[in-house]
Interface confidence: low
């Protein structure tokens, strides 16, 4: 019989608000009080096995004791009522768990979406954490009909998908109730026609067709989602070239009502474009569909839009009456080639004489010409047609080039090597820029580019390396032939020299020494040598440093001590730092020449 609890605690399963006060009462049973010879004075309250101070107890009568908590801060409290029996032994009477938390806040930001082909889903902001099991119920009704409640699942408490089919063009009222053990609150009601909450499926079967007539257009066709039957659609159509990462967009006003095709204009010829499309209700009420799967197409070819860059080189060793000329040109970039290049056509006309035609697949042509003046033309051909012609005058052998560019400068900027000049007063047809790496080990292999006659500043469009010395030549080209070339050296990026200068003595006297050194080879300079520093010291003395201009190759150290061993080394400096050469030692003689001890 005594397995029966000795009493009970009221309330049995309390749920209380955090930071509120709470009182529990323990009531002892008569039979227990008789058995253990106790009354309410013998009750000891404990929380989580720790005894509660007596100041929090109240003896209500001989059978009942209460305990009061102020500002409950724990979410879960194990509260036990115990009695002190014979010999101060504790006997548990009853235990409860006090759960604490917060009442629900009014749900906010209720919004609904009808994903096409699915039932309506609403979501909301449930407010602060309550620490209690809180049930959210989505309620909905027509003016004349209540729909079944939608109870949010525990793992997704702030959204719910209704169980009924969506009816468009009839307003529905929707709200959310939040309820837990501490209270119940209702969100604001929202009233809407579900047609304004539609998220269509994306258009599908997107395909791209090109046009032989126009190389600047591509026609898109697609299948609209079934929701087209319910709403008028508008579209976003985006496109990009295959290698681009950013999308361009068709002006939305051009795609503002239901359609299943669209012609995109102003595209580049022979270019692969990627397209995607999405749709939504035309008045902008609702949600954009996801993007369709991407589809790509290539615009039709067009004739090359530009003549290639065109230049020539003459072999300096020429036979009597003839010279070997190499005509060179650049491949057009894809956006100017506008198609697959088939071949190049070169014509050479001896001044006021006969014309020779050449069809070439390469980007150079070597010909033997007389010493006369020639006119060369170059066109490039693809499937659609030929480019305009590039025209070049190859002057006669005795031609004297004049009128160079002035104030030629070259400088690095933004990881590119820029060249600028002052234009000559005469009318320039174009400029040819040639550049090569200066090296003691290898010949200067030239790359080149062409610029319009209006240009006076450009950057070198090649794969340039850092810490290499580039010899850059700019030649203006006039109607009657090339002008005088002007050259300049430049670095894309300087570095300290790879080696320092090797110093040696040219002449050593009792109190002075003439040092000499060679200019550093260009391959190890890594930049413009701005100055040298000579460091010299005796074994026991301090080091002395002397700065020397970079144009010098010798220097005289004076005020030296006779009969002394000197250590000397030399550093060369570019704009990016210096490098020491090897150390060299010499000894000054005890006596000057002709001097006797």
């Amino acid at each position: 019989e005594l397995l029966d609890p000795c009493g009970y605690i009221s309330p049995e399963s309390p749920v209380v608000q955090l930071h509120s006060n709470f009182t529990a009462v323990c009531v002892l049973k008569e039979k227990c009080m008789d058995y253990f010879h106790v009354n309410a004075n013998y009750i000891v309250w404990k929380t989580n096995h720790f005894t509660i101070p007596k100041e929090q107890y109240t003896i209500i009568n001989r059978t009942a004791s209460s305990v009061t908590f102020t500002d409950i801060a724990s979410l879960n409290i194990q509260l036990t009522c115990n009695i002190l029996t014979f010999g101060q032994l504790e006997q548990n009477v009853y235990g409860i768990t006090i759960i604490s938390g917060l009442p629900p806040e009014k749900p906010k930001n209720l919004s609904c979406i009808v994903n096409e082909g699915k039932k309506m889903r609403c979501e909301w902001d449930g407010g602060r954490e309550t620490h209690l099991e809180t049930n959210f119920t989505l309620k909905s009704e027509w003016a004349t009909h209540k729909f079944a409640d939608c109870k949010a699942k525990r793992d997704t408490p702030t959204s719910c998908t209704v169980d009924y089919s969506t009816v468009y063009f009839v307003n529905i009222e929707v709200w959310v109730e939040a309820e837990n053990a501490l209270g119940k609150v209702t969100s604001d009601h929202i009233n809407f026609d579900p047609v304004y909450k539609v998220k269509p499926n994306p258009p599908h079967n997107l395909s791209v067709i090109n046009s032989e007539e126009l190389s600047s257009i591509l026609k898109l066709t697609w299948t609209n989602p079934s929701i087209k039957s319910v709403i008028i659609l508008k579209y976003n159509i985006q496109y990009r070239t295959k290698d681009a990462s950013t999308w361009s967009q068709i002006p939305p006003e051009d795609t503002a009502s239901t359609r299943s095709s669209f012609t995109v204009q102003d595209l580049k010829p022979f270019t692969e474009y990627v397209f995607r499309i999405r749709c939504m209700k035309e008045d902008g009420k609702g949600y954009w569909s996801d993007w369709s799967e991407e589809a790509s197409g290539i615009t039709y070819e067009d004739r090359p839009s530009k003549a290639p860059s065109f230049w020539y080189k003459i072999d300096p060793s020429h036979t009597q009456g003839y010279r070997t000329v190499q005509l060179v040109w650049k491949t057009l970039p894809p956006f100017e080639a506008n198609g697959k290049i088939l071949d190049y056509e070169v014509t050479l006309t001896r001044w006021k004489s006969h014309l020779q035609n050449y069809t070439v697949n390469a980007t150079k042509l070597t010909v033997n010409l007389t010493n006369d003046r020639y006119l060369a033309t170059l066109t490039v051909r693809n499937l659609v047609g030929k480019s305009d012609a590039a025209v070049l005058t190859i002057p006669a052998c005795d031609f004297q080039a004049t009128h160079p560019v002035m104030d030629l400068k070259a400088f690095p900027k933004d990881n590119m090597l820029w060249v600028e000049w002052t234009t000559p007063r005469e009318s320039v047809k174009k400029y040819i820029l040639e550049w090569c790496v200066l090296s003691d080990k290898a010949p200067c292999i030239t790359d080149w580019q062409q610029e319009d006659g209006t240009v006076h500043r450009t950057y070198l469009r090649g794969n340039l390396a850092e810490s290499k010395c580039y010899l850059i030549t700019v030649t203006p080209v006039y109607a009657d032939g090339p002008g005088s070339p002007e050259s300049i050296k430049a670095y894309l990026k300087q570095a300290p020299p790879s080696k320092g200068p090797t110093v040696r003595t040219k002449k050593v006297g009792k109190n002075e020494a003439v040092l000499e050194w060679d200019q550093l080879p260009v391959d190890v300079q890594n930049g413009f040598i701005r100055n040298y520093t000579i460091f010299y010291r005796t074994i026991i003395g301090n080091e002395t440093a002397v700065n020397v201009d970079s144009s010098h190759t010798e220097y005289t150290l004076s005020s030296l001590t006779s009969d002394t061993l000197y250590m000397v080394r030399m550093a060369a400096y570019t704009d990016e730092g210096g490098k020491d050469g090897p150390e060299f030692t010499f000894t000054t003689p005890k006596f000057a020449q002709g001097e006797i001890e």
Partner: antibody
Framework: EVQLVQSGAEVKKPGESLKISCKGS????????IDWVRQMPGKGLEWMGI????????RYSPSFQGQVTMSVDKSISTAYLQWSSLKASDTAIYYC??????????????????????WGQGTTVTVSS | DIQMTQSPSSLSASVGDRVTITCRAS??????LNWYQQKPGKAPKLLIY???SLQSGVPSRFSGSGSGTDFTLTISSLQPEDFATYYC??????????FGQGTRLEIK
């Protein structure tokens, strides 16, 4: 003003072919379904089928499947109803009507809701030998 | 197919009368029912959609009610221009859309 204008009355012999038209104006023609409805002399209304002008999606009533063909030319906002071989029993007034967009969505199916809010004036077809 | 049955097939009434026409569906069609009015030699005209919604421009003396299988069109006070044939039409299950056989309303 939203309107549907149908082609004029036709008198034909059995076995002949026929194509009648219905031209929409005053609204986005490609965005609304077009219904075709038959009314035989002194009788009630019979629904023949429906076509969506933008992509020519067509649904026929089982009673008219294979008997008629519905088509559209969206470039001129016109819907057509045609017969390849007329019968005397095809004598009737044929109406086109704009199907006001109303639909119930249930899973992946759609149920047409509202009704035919704009009607053509009707085309009388008489088939007699 | 869903069958629509109208009653009566015809009825006579006077100007100012309250008139009720009923339409029964062979199975539940929820509220997917429309009412049309057709005058001789003219195309039908939509009066009521979704069982009880009044089409724009239709006088308020016309009203519709019902859901499931039983529907009613009521004209609260008959006017001379209301004498015509009335059709109910379901669009719950398509194809096909089906019409009732019509109710002819004549002047008494």
């Amino acid at each position: 003003e939203v309107q549907l204008v149908q082609s004029g009355a036709e008198v034909k012999k059995p076995g002949e072919s026929l194509k009648i038209s219905c031209k929409g104006s005053g609204y986005s023609f490609t965005s609304y379904w077009i219904d075709w409805v038959r009314q035989m002399p002194g009788k009630g209304l019979e629904w023949m089928g429906i076509i969506y002008p933008d992509d020519s999606d067509t649904r026929y009533s089982p009673s008219f499947q294979g008997q008629v063909t519905m088509s559209v030319d969206k470039s001129i906002s016109t819907a057509y109803l045609q017969w390849s071989s007329l019968k005397a029993s095809d004598t009737a007034i044929y109406y086109c009507a704009r199907h006001e967009r109303g639909i119930v969505e249930a899973g992946t199916d759609y149920y047409y809701y509202y009704g035919m809010d704009v009607w053509g004036q009707g085309t009388t077809v008489t088939v007699s030998s | 197919d869903i069958q629509m049955t109208q009653s009566p097939s015809s009825l006579s009434a006077s100007v100012g009368d309250r008139v009720t026409i009923t339409c029964r569906a062979s199975q539940s069609i929820s509220s997917y029912l429309n009412w049309y009015q057709q005058k001789p030699g003219k195309a039908p005209k939509l009066l009521i959609y979704a069982a009880s919604s009044l089409q724009s421009g239709v006088p308020s003396r016309f009203s519709g009610s019902g859901s499931g299988t039983d529907f009613t069109l009521t004209i609260s006070s008959l006017q001379p221009e209301d004498f015509a044939t009335y059709y109910c039409q379901q669009s719950y299950s398509t194809p096909p859309i089906t019409f009732g056989q019509g109710t002819r309303l004549e002047i008494k």
